[in-house]
Interface confidence: low
């Protein structure tokens, strides 16, 4: 019996399959090369092509940049000759790997170019507040496609001590549940660290002036963040979920978290920032529903309901 050549094991034809691709979201900084990855298997050998924003994109035909394209691969790297070249290449990319049995398609790869971060110049007025009252010192860092780290320091580069009373929110603002005369400083400085560009920038110092009073008035809790009674969030399966509640009041409120539909998934939940932040690791379908924070002190309570919808990543 003669077996035709194409049926021998090593000659079996295979349609293309994408084996490696860039993440769906890619942030590049001014000094970075742009590398987009697309690898595929298939027999006969696959041919690659790219689209950007739905239009055929040929990396090697781009002017003013150096392109390295791997042989037998769809991956390529673009190196620019100026500090702003990455802006040109922002868009949604897709890789197609084809042979005569068909075409495989990568997911959409959103390439975002991050400019050099700058804080807009502003005149910062002193913040005046009576002892016992609450106050929020804004940070408002420049927008960034990549997560950045925020620090509050004084002019001696010492971190501002945080506790149940003083806390920095996920948004970078510094929240005081109630102020003491010891908070009186002229140099509250918000620092933003952009890991991608290895850049640290700082905001103009804020002068916090606390007026002493003879008697601090007790106040029941009120949420400084979020300010409304409920909010809706979409969480992606497999991703972490971070919920936050920051309250003001005197005495300093404590924060509790609960899940009205039953217990929290204790094995995957961590509480941070003196209980003001709830982090749920690796969200699953069963985490869908309502999460509630409660701020309490001896005078009363305030609460916020987070309605979380879990969607496939």
């Amino acid at each position: 019996i003669q077996i035709p050549e194409e049926y021998e094991g090593h000659h079996v034809m295979e349609p293309p399959v994408i084996t490696e691709q860039s993440p769906r979201r890619l942030v590049v900084f001014p000094t970075d090369d742009i590398s987009l990855k697309c690898e595929a298997s298939g027999k006969p050998e696959v041919q690659f092509r790219w689209t950007r924003d739905g239009v055929h994109f040929k990396p090697k035909e781009e002017l003013g940049v150096t392109v390295y394209q791997s042989p037998h691969s769809g991956s390529f790297t673009i190196t620019g000759n100026n500090s702003n070249f990455a802006q040109r290449f922002q868009g949604i990319y897709r890789c197609f790997a084809s042979n005569k049995l068909g075409t495989a398609m990568s997911h959409e790869i959103r390439l975002m170019a991050e400019g050099a971060p700058k804080w807009p110049k502003e005149t910062v007025k002193p913040v005046e507040v009576e002892e016992g009252e609450s106050v929020v010192l804004p940070c408002n860092p420049p927008p960034s496609a990549e997560p950045l780290r925020i620090y509050w320091m004084n002019s001696k580069i010492l971190h501002i001590k945080q506790d149940e009373r003083v806390t920095m929110g996920q948004n970078g603002n510094l929240y005081f549940a109630n102020v003491l005369t010891s908070d009186n400083h002229s140099d509250y400085i918000c620092h933003a660290h952009f890991p991608g560009t290895r850049t640290i920038i700082q905001k103009e110092p804020i002068d916090l002036r606390v007026k002493a009073t003879n008697s601090m008035i007790d106040r029941k809790p009120r949420l400084l963040f979020p300010t409304n009674s409920s909010s809706h969030l979409v969480a992606l399966q497999g991703q972490p979920l971070v919920l936050e509640c920051i309250a003001e009041g005197f005495p300093t409120p404590t924060i509790k978290w609960l899940r009205p539909s039953g217990p929290m998934p204790a094995d995957r939940v961590t509480y941070q920032n003196h209980n003001k932040t709830l982090q749920l690791l690796k969200v699953g379908e069963e985490d869908d529903g309502e999460y509630r924070c409660l701020a309490e002190n001896s005078l009363g309570s305030a609460r916020h309901a987070y309605y979380v919808t879990v969607e496939a990543a």
């Epitope: 809706h232 978290w257 609960l258 409660l294 309901a305």
Partner: antibody, heavy 118, light 113 residues
Framework: QVQLVQPGDELVKPGASVKLSCKAS????????MQWVKQRPGQGLEWIGE????????NYNEMFKSKAVLSVDKSVSTAYMQLSSLTAEDTAVYYC???????????WGQGTLVTVSS | DIVMTQSPDSLAVSLGERVTMNCKSS????????????LAWYQQKPGQPPKLLIY???TRESGVPDRFSGSGSGTDFTLTISSLQAEDVALYYC?????????FGQGTKLEIK
């Protein structure tokens, strides 16, 4: 203040359906789950299910899954419960109640008495 | 489902006397992360809807007289009325809100002797 207003009595024939309403006021309707509870004459309380008015999400007691359907109309801050294929066993007072996850069921409607009789 | 069992089914107590009634759950209602017991007590008078008395097993709802108190943890809970008043005649239900479906006890009927 918080109020949950339910209509009075309903007399329905066996095999028929009835849609009960619960009109909410005095709070943000979409912020809290609405509960429904059954109480047969001279008997205890049974939890039927709940609905989240903000997104229509429901949780049912398995015992009532084929009996009750919960819904809301956010525009009029009203929750509804439709009961189908009624029998004498469904004769009961049906309460809506507000459950905000912290204080258990802290506000209740006055209840609607559903009488199933031919 | 979590089964809630109340005892006794009924009791008669003289005015001014101390009243205790019990509620047992088929599984623990204590959530270790927040050390809360997901149990509530309700009072129901004839022709009226239930009224919340106690939540988290021991926290009195605002406006509830301080003669009412709740205690217990895990699976065994108690509602105590320190000095019975005429207006306390009613049915008392415990309810768990730990797991779906939420379930009530069968009730304890309190009367005056």
């Amino acid at each position: 203040q918080v109020q949950l207003v339910q209509p009075g009595d309903e007399l329905v024939k066996p095999g028929a359906s009835v849609k009960l309403s619960c009109k909410a006021s005095g709070y943000t309707f979409t912020s809290y789950w609405m509960q429904w509870v059954k109480q047969r004459p001279g008997q205890g309380l049974e939890w039927i299910g709940e609905i989240n008015p903000s997104n229509g999400r429901t949780n049912y007691n398995e015992m009532f899954k084929s009996k009750a359907v919960l819904s809301v109309d956010k525009s009029v801050s009203t929750a509804y419960m439709q009961l189908s294929s009624l029998t004498a066993e469904d004769t009961a007072v049906y309460y809506c109640a507000l459950y905000d996850g912290y204080y258990a069921m802290d506000y209740w409607g006055q209840g609607t008495l559903v009488t199933v009789s031919s | 489902d979590i089964v809630m069992t109340q005892s006794p089914d009924s009791l008669a107590v003289s005015l001014g006397e101390r009243v205790t009634m019990n509620c047992k759950s088929s599984q623990s209602l204590l959530y270790s992360s927040n050390q809360k017991n997901y149990l509530a007590w309700y009072q129901q008078k004839p022709g009226q809807p239930p009224k919340l008395l106690i939540y988290w097993a021991s926290t009195r709802e605002s406006g509830v007289p301080d003669r009412f108190s709740g205690s217990g943890s895990g699976t065994d809970f108690t509602l105590t009325i320190s000095s019975l008043q005429a207006e306390d005649v009613a049915l008392y239900y415990c309810q768990q809100y730990h797991s779906y479906p939420f379930t009530f006890g069968q009730g304890t009927k309190l009367e005056i002797k």
